[in-house]
């Protein structure tokens, strides 16, 4: 392990769509990918008339995007889906939208999935 | 093992429309993104766009902004690539490529624009 | 983003030690470590040997290698063989917030 770095060896995991896709609701996902990369949580949910629906939490390959992130923070000024990514085991369990491109004091959304 | 199978060949007439598909196995689909690159023949490569496979999220090159769209269907674990207003230019082999380095790449798509 | 800059062709004989190089700018190449390194085969697709600058793909010899210095990105074949004729592109991490951009190819002749 490089010292500073979370590695992560596994995600909440979370599917919406679970009956159509044939997976669990809900679990903990271990993390598989080659050896030598680095492998990240996710999170996806939308934001419906400001009620939070997740879509999807599991794990996500290597990407410079999620490098050193330690919180699943989305940045992007109203996406249509939320997404975002954060290393270190079930950093997924909470997720935030931080708008980088925001004038005003941006707002946060921490949620903490509840088991239905 | 990870693969990448694209569908066949095609060949389009100037001014028309071409969708071709990239079908995923051997991972999570929705655990990354799909790239797709094209190459002219004796050309180089070319990056097109890429879509995060769980939020749909998309990012073209500018040159095919407008022309392209990238699309991903999550129940098949297939993504797709349409470009429009097809001209003999867009005569190429199209890829699709696993992931932000592009780590599995499909076998290719030959696209031929002709009259 | 424009493209990368590489030189159209290199050569060297078996054993030999070759180095393609691959320019770009102060807000590309130079600033970040997310350059990549394809080789391929005539009629074949792409194949990722290098990512991150400097880290080899599994399976990939250690004879090829991966630095970078300022705006250029370099990749290195040592010990040459009959079955590294190829083309090389260098390449950008496309996803996210990043767009892609390859080099124009080097085409590598074994001598």
């Known amino acids: 392990a490089i010292l500073g770095r979370s590695e992560t060896q596994e995600c909440l995991f979370f599917n919406a769509n679970w009956e159509r896709d044939r997976t669990n609701q809900t679990g903990v996902e271990p993390c598989y990918g080659d050896k030598d990369k680095r492998r990240h949580c996710f999170a996806t949910w939308k934001n419906i008339s400001g009620s939070i629906e997740i879509v999807k939490q599991g794990c996500w390959l290597d990407d410079i995007n999620c490098y050193d992130r330690t919180d699943c923070i989305e940045k992007k000024d109203s996406p249509e889906v939320y997404f975002c990514c954060c290393e270190g085991n079930m950093c997924n369990e909470k997720f935030s939208y931080f708008p980088e491109m925001e004038v005003t004091q941006p707002t946060s959304n921490p949620v903490t999935p509840k088991p239905p | 093992q990870v693969q990448l199978v694209q569908s066949g060949a095609e060949v389009k007439k100037p001014g028309s429309s071409v969708k071709v598909s990239c079908k995923a196995s051997g991972y999570t689909f929705t655990s990354s993104y799909i790239n797709w690159v094209r190459q002219a023949p004796g050309q180089g490569l070319e990056w097109m766009g890429t879509i995060n496979a769980v939020s749909g999220s998309t990012s073209y090159a500018q040159k095919f902004q407008g022309r392209v769209t990238i699309t991903a269907d999550t129940s098949t674990s297939t993504a797709y690539m349409e470009l429009s207003s097809l001209r003999s230019e867009d005569t190429a082999v199209y890829y699709c490529?696993?992931?932000?380095?592009?780590?599995?790449w499909g076998q290719g798509t030959l696209v031929t624009v002709s009259s | 983003q424009s493209a990368l800059t590489q030189p159209r062709s290199v050569s060297g004989s078996p054993g030999q030690s070759v180095t393609i190089s691959c320019t770009g700018t102060s807000s590309d190449v130079g600033s970040k470590n997310y350059v990549n390194w394809y080789q391929q085969h005539p009629g074949k697709a792409p194949k990722l040997m290098i990512y991150g600058v400097s880290k080899r793909e599994s399976g990939v010899p250690d004879r090829f290698s991966g630095s970078k210095s300022g705006n250029t990105a370099s990749l290195t074949i040592s010990g040459l063989q009959a079955e590294d004729e190829a083309d090389y592109y260098c390449?950008?991490?496309?996803?996210?917030?990043?767009?892609?951009?390859f080099g124009g190819g080097t085409k590598l002749t074994v001598l």
């Open positions: 390449g950008t991490f496309a996803g996210g917030k990043y767009y892609g951009v």
């Open positions: 490529a696993r992931g932000g380095w592009f780590d599995y």
